[in-house]
Interface confidence: low
C-alpha cells in the first residue's frame, strides 16, 4: 500500500518512539514448505540448538552450530583446507519491559546463526 | 530478568493482541564486527539484493540469491554434482497499519534468504 502522505518513515528521528503493535501475525504460515534437511546434506553441516526465553517474542529461536571446523568432501571426509562458517542474520525480537509485563515491549536486535556455508580460508602472504 | 509472576507468555491465547512497543532498539550495534565476505568466498557464493519497503520496519532488508545452480570447486569451476541452495530464515517485521499511519503497526512474518550453502542433491533411484 502506498505510504499515507505526511506519515514519517518509522526510522525517521521524528517518528514516535512508542507505537501500538497488533500481535495477530500476518503471513503466519510462511514456513509451511520449509522442512529442509540442508543442515545434514550440506558440505558444511550444522546442528540446531533451541534458544528459549519466555521474556522474548518469539520465545523460541533455533540457532545453528557448525559441526566441523572444515568442510565435508564428496567422500564424506572433513577437508581442513576449507572452513565451515556460520551465516549470521540480524533479527528483530520483542523484549518484555519488566515494569509493565502485560502489554509493554521494546524492540531488540539479535544476531542469530541461521546455517553454515563452506568458505576458502583467507590466505595471508608472508614476505 | 525472571518473568513477572502472573504475566502470560506473549504467545498465549489470552495475551493482549495489541501491545505497546518502544522502538529505541536495544543491542543496536550487534553487527559492528560483521563485515564478512563469506558471500564471495563460499563454495556456494551469493549476491545480495536490497529489498526496500517504506511501510515496513525495518524498511531495508538484504536478500541473498545464489549465483550458481552448482557449487564452486577448488579450481574455481562450477560442479553440478552439488547444488547451491539458499538458507532461509523466518523473521518478524512491523507492517504499518494503513488506517493509523503514525503509530499503529502489525507484526508480520517474512521468509528471507540469508546466504547459500552447498548440498549433495537428493538422488532418487529409479527402478
Amino acid at each position: 500500500s502506498p505510504q499515507n502522505p505526511g506519515c514519517p518513515n518509522a526510522e525517521d528521528k521524528n517518528f514516535p518512539r512508542t507505537v501500538m503493535v497488533n500481535l495477530n501475525i500476518r503471513n503466519r504460515n510462511t514456513n509451511s514448505k520449509r522442512a529442509s534437511d540442508y543442515y545434514n546434506r550440506s558440505s558444511s553441516p550444522w546442528n540446531l540448538h533451541r534458544n528459549e526465553d519466555p521474556e522474548r517474542y518469539p520465545s523460541v529461536i533455533w540457532e545453528a552450530k557448525c559441526r566441523h571446523l572444515g568442510c565435508v568432501d564428496a567422500d564424506g571426509n572433513v577437508d581442513y583446507h576449507m572452513n565451515s562458517v556460520p551465516i549470521q542474520q540480524e533479527i528483530l525480537v520483542l523484549r518484555r519491559e519488566p515494569r509493565h509485563c502485560t502489554n509493554s515491549f521494546r524492540l531488540e536486535k539479535m544476531l542469530v546463526s541461521v546455517g553454515c556455508t563452506c568458505v576458502t580460508p583467507i590466505v595471508r602472504h608472508v614476505a | 530478568s525472571p518473568q513477572n509472576p502472573g504475566c502470560p507468555n506473549a504467545e498465549d491465547k489470552n495475551f493482549p493482541r495489541t501491545v505497546m512497543v518502544n522502538l529505541n532498539i536495544r543491542n543496536r550495534n550487534t553487527n559492528s564486527k560483521r563485515a564478512s565476505d563469506y558471500y564471495n568466498r563460499s563454495s556456494s557464493p551469493w549476491n545480495l539484493h536490497r529489498n526496500e519497503d517504506p511501510e515496513r520496519y525495518p524498511s531495508v532488508i538484504w536478500e541473498a540469491k545464489c549465483r550458481h545452480l552448482g557449487c564452486v570447486d577448488a579450481d574455481g569451476n562450477v560442479d553440478y554434482h552439488m547444488n547451491s541452495v539458499p538458507i532461509q530464515q523466518e523473521i518478524l517485521v512491523l507492517r504499518r497499519e494503513p488506517r493509523h499511519c503514525t503509530n499503529s503497526f502489525r507484526l508480520e512474518k517474512m521468509l528471507v534468504s540469508v546466504g547459500c550453502t552447498c548440498v549433495t542433491p537428493i538422488v532418487r533411484h529409479v527402478a
Epitope: 540448538h49 571446523l69 | 564486527k33 563485515a35
Partner: nanobody, 124 residues
Framework: EVQLVESGGGLVQAGGSQRLSCTAS????????MGWYRQAPGKQRELVAL???????DYADSVKGRFTISRDNAKNTVYLEMNSLKAEDTAVYYC??????????????????WGQGTQVTVSS
C-alpha cells in the same frame, strides 16, 4: 598473527587422567569455536570435542562421558579433561580454533587456526 600453543601431553597409564590446555594469542577479536582433534599413527585426523562461543559443546561418540571440554573466554584458553584413558586414545592431539582477528588493519571475520600438536600416549 594468531598462535595456538598446547600443553599437557605425555605418557599416562590406562585408566588414568590427563588434562590438555591450549591458549590462543594475537590480535584476536572473537573466538567462535575452540576444540581438539587427534590423529593416531596411520589414521585420519578426527574430531574429539568442540566448544562454541555460547558454551555448548560437541563430542565424538568415542569420548562421550570420559572427556570434558571447557574454555576460559577471558584467557582465550580451551581445556580438555581426559578420564578413563584407553590405549586407543593414544594420538597427537591438536588444538583448533575458528577465530576473528585483526591483521594489518584488516578484520578477518573467520579463519581456522591449528596448534602444533601434543603427543598423548596411553600405556596398557
Amino acid at each position: 598473527e594468531v598462535q595456538l600453543v598446547e600443553s599437557g601431553g605425555g605418557l599416562v597409564q590406562a585408566g588414568g587422567s590427563q588434562r590438555l590446555s591450549c591458549t590462543a594469542s594475537g590480535t584476536i577479536v572473537n573466538i567462535h569455536v575452540m576444540g581438539w582433534y587427534r590423529q593416531a599413527p596411520g589414521k585420519q585426523r578426527e574430531l574429539v570435542a568442540l566448544i562454541f562461543s555460547g558454551g555448548s559443546a560437541d563430542y565424538a561418540d568415542s569420548v562421550k562421558g570420559r572427556f570434558t571440554i571447557s574454555r576460559d573466554n577471558a584467557k582465550n584458553t580451551v581445556y580438555l579433561e581426559m578420564n578413563s584413558l584407553k590405549a586407543e586414545d593414544t594420538a597427537v592431539y591438536y588444538c583448533a580454533a575458528e577465530i576473528g582477528y585483526y591483521s594489518g588493519g584488516t578484520y578477518y571475520s573467520s579463519e581456522a587456526h591449528w596448534g602444533q600438536g601434543t603427543q598423548v600416549t596411553v600405556s596398557s
